[in-house]
């Protein structure tokens, strides 16, 4: 037999199908010019010492072969003895290691078999009524195709599906969309209406994420507030990576899950912007404010479920950092300024009330005064901190108040509002004899004592009504009792108590008169 002809003899090896999983497959045959034809196939398995034979049987039942040697592609002309105008059946037999492996047969009319391309270029993927829609441009001069897809998940083998006939310059396919696993798709095409025409190669993989992005399973920790009034949010556990099918591992555009961090600063509600969304890889520094943090996972089909945490406010207080002066026109606060052109947010709320009831005020950008202090003033009419109760005050600062992650905490402290000097006056002052020359003075705690760090001390004043001599005794803010000694029997005394803050002297309580009775010996 001549090498250019199909040899109508028995092939030079025994006819036996090994039935093994390896061997030739994906045989495709088509016309490549007016009188020339090509068949190509793939071979799976070790290729050393393999000889391929292209078998062809005519409808009469007569069969022939082409010897291809080690090649997996063979061309022949319409003069090779193969009927090109009538239906023929072709397959490949590969002789290797003393056994024959056979490809699946293809039955076709060679003259009408055109080489079809798989979808080339960009395959657009979208979601349509719970299904996956793929769309691509029909390859040039190939309108009219039958299209198949195959798909697999990380844990399942390929499954074949049909896209149906296509007859336009764009083609599309509806495919199943998995809820929770990524999929790899490939598409192939063949000529429509040409009985037995060969399938194209499979397209490049199309990697598709699950409909629902995986719920982020992450944990955060927040560091201590630093000297700069900021604390770092750190990720303790990275989100789990999506498992990908074999063909999507490595670079798999389409299956990416993006995790975003959404910060909501709960404190200082009067600022311009309360929320900010960041990439999860870029962990922010936060002020000592309270925040809600959400991690949102999303893929090309949109956002998934999110995971949320509450980061409580840092309640570490610095009682000495804030100076408050109360004048006839109103109240002014002073604190060490942070830098030039800073905007400050002063937030206050009555102690013991829900955090949602905080009030705040935003200052215009201000530079430090000559003493290096920043200030905030308000009039009595404004009603700010006007009630005689304990307020928790936090001051935040930012050079860029519109950027949520650039706020820092300047200080947190307590302040007693209203007329603190009068409101703090101790009540229920009582005097009890203690010894022949001493008495014990007791009083009810000042309202100022409910405000941590505000009450600096009590002062107990004792006045000798005869000599008009006055003595004052400082008492620790935690104490509500003092012993006055060195008193003389029969002398009238008055005692008063006041409560002082660091910046304000209190108002004396009502004078309480007492005397030590003269003891008469028997």
């Amino acid at each position: 037999c001549r090498t250019s002809e199909c040899c109508f003899q028995d092939p030079p090896y025994p006819d036996a199908d090994s039935g093994s999983a390896s061997g030739p497959r994906d045989l495709r045959c088509y016309r490549i010019s007016s009188d020339r034809y090509e068949c190509s196939w793939q071979y799976e398995g070790p290729t050393a010492g393999v000889s391929h034979f292209l078998r062809c049987c005519l409808s009469s039942g007569r069969c022939c072969y082409f010897a291809a040697g080690s090649a997996t592609r063979l061309q022949f002309s319409d003069q090779a003895g193969v009927s090109v105008l009538y239906t023929v059946t072709l397959w490949v037999e590969s002789w290797a290691r003393n056994q024959t492996e056979k490809s699946p047969e293809v039955t076709l009319q060679l003259y009408n078999s055109v080489k079809y391309e798989p979808p080339l270029g960009d395959i657009k993927v979208s979601k349509l009524a719970g299904q996956l829609r793929m769309e691509w441009e029909t390859p040039d001069n190939q309108v009219g195709a039958e299209v198949q897809f195959r798909h697999r998940t990380p844990s399942s083998p390929w499954k074949l599906g049909d896209c149906g006939p296509q007859d336009d310059d764009t083609e599309s396919c509806l495919c199943p969309l998995e809820m929770n696993v990524a999929q790899e798709f490939q598409l192939r095409r063949r000529q429509l209406g040409s009985q037995g025409s060969s399938w194209s190669k499979w397209s490049s993989p199309v990697c598709v994420p699950p409909e629902n992005p995986p719920q982020p399973q992450v944990r955060f920790s927040v560091e201590q507030l630093g000297q700069d009034g900021r604390r770092r949010l750190t990720l303790k556990e990275q989100p789990t990576q999506l498992e990908l099918p074999e063909g999507c591992q490595g670079l798999a555009p389409g299956t990416e899950v993006t995790y975003r961090l959404q910060l909501h600063m709960l404190s200082c509600p009067c600022k311009a912007k309360a929320t900010r969304t960041l990439h999860l890889g870029k962990m922010p520094y936060l002020s000592g404010a309270a925040y809600n943090v959400a991690v949102i996972s999303s893929n090309q089909f949109g956002p998934g479920l999110n995971q949320t945490w509450h980061i409580p406010a840092d309640t570490h207080t610095e009682p000495v950092a804030l100076n408050i002066s109360v004048g006839t026109n109103g109240t002014t606060m002073y604190w060490p300024a942070r830098a030039q052109s800073m905007t400050y947010c002063i937030e206050w709320q009555p102690v013991g009330q829900d955090g949602g009831l905080a009030t705040c005020s935003l200052t215009a950008p201000q530079d430090p005064d000559p003493a290096g202090m920043a200030t905030y003033s308000w009039s009595r009419e404004s009603g700010a901190m006007g009630q005689e109760k304990c307020y928790y005050i936090t001051i935040f600062a930012s050079a860029h108040p519109e950027k949520l992650t650039l706020w820092s905490t300047v200080l947190s402290t307590y302040h007693f509002g209203g007329n603190a000097s009068a409101a703090g006056t101790p009540h229920h002052v009582s005097v009890k004899n203690h010894s022949l020359d001493s008495v014990s003075v007791d009083w009810a705690p000042s309202l100022l004592s409910t405000c941590p760090g505000v009450l600096k001390e009590y002062v107990v004043r004792c006045r000798d009504e005869d000599s008009k001599q006055v003595s004052e005794h400082p008492v620790q803010p935690t104490e509500t009792q003092v012993t006055l000694s060195g008193l003389r029997a029969g002398v009238a005394y008055t005692v008063q108590v006041r409560a002082d803050t660091a910046w304000l002297r209190g108002v004396w309580s009502q004078p309480q008169r007492f005397s030590i009775e003269v003891q008469v010996s028997d």
């Epitope: 049987c57 039942g61 059946t89 397959w91 056979k102 490809s103 699946p104 009985q195």
Partner: nanobody
């Protein structure tokens, strides 16, 4: 090893029907075209009907319109539905791979059409 087991033959009156089955093993059934062949006494074996991998069929002129070949790849089985049987359909019926028929032939199944 290739094995082909035919069944379903029998005695039937002219105009009657029969369905033959052939179960194959030892090769990848879904990858091969299959055929039904018959051999009457004193005659050569002839191809009656064939079916390709893709399900396309063709028939000998003498049986067109009366016989139908089909396949079930899940069961590795090929069928021949024979209607309007005639006495000249009497023969031993075999199935085999279509291209080229193997050296392995089953024992066949006898179909006799007689009144």
């Amino acid at each position: 090893e290739v094995q082909l087991v035919e069944s379903g033959g029998g005695l039937v009156q002219p105009g009657g029907s029969l369905t033959l089955s052939c179960t194959a093993s030892g090769f990848r059934f879904s990858d091969r075209s299959m055929g039904w062949y018959r051999q009457a006494p004193g005659k050569q074996r002839e191809l009656v009907a064939a079916i390709t991998v893709g399900g396309s069929t063709n028939y000998a002129d003498s049986v067109k319109g009366r016989f139908t070949i089909s396949r079930d790849n899940a069961k590795n089985t090929v069928y021949l539905q024979m209607n309007s049987l005639k006495p000249e359909d009497t023969a031993l019926y075999y199935c085999n791979r279509r291209y080229p028929p193997d050296d392995y032939w089953g024992q066949g199944t006898q179909v006799t059409v007689s009144s």
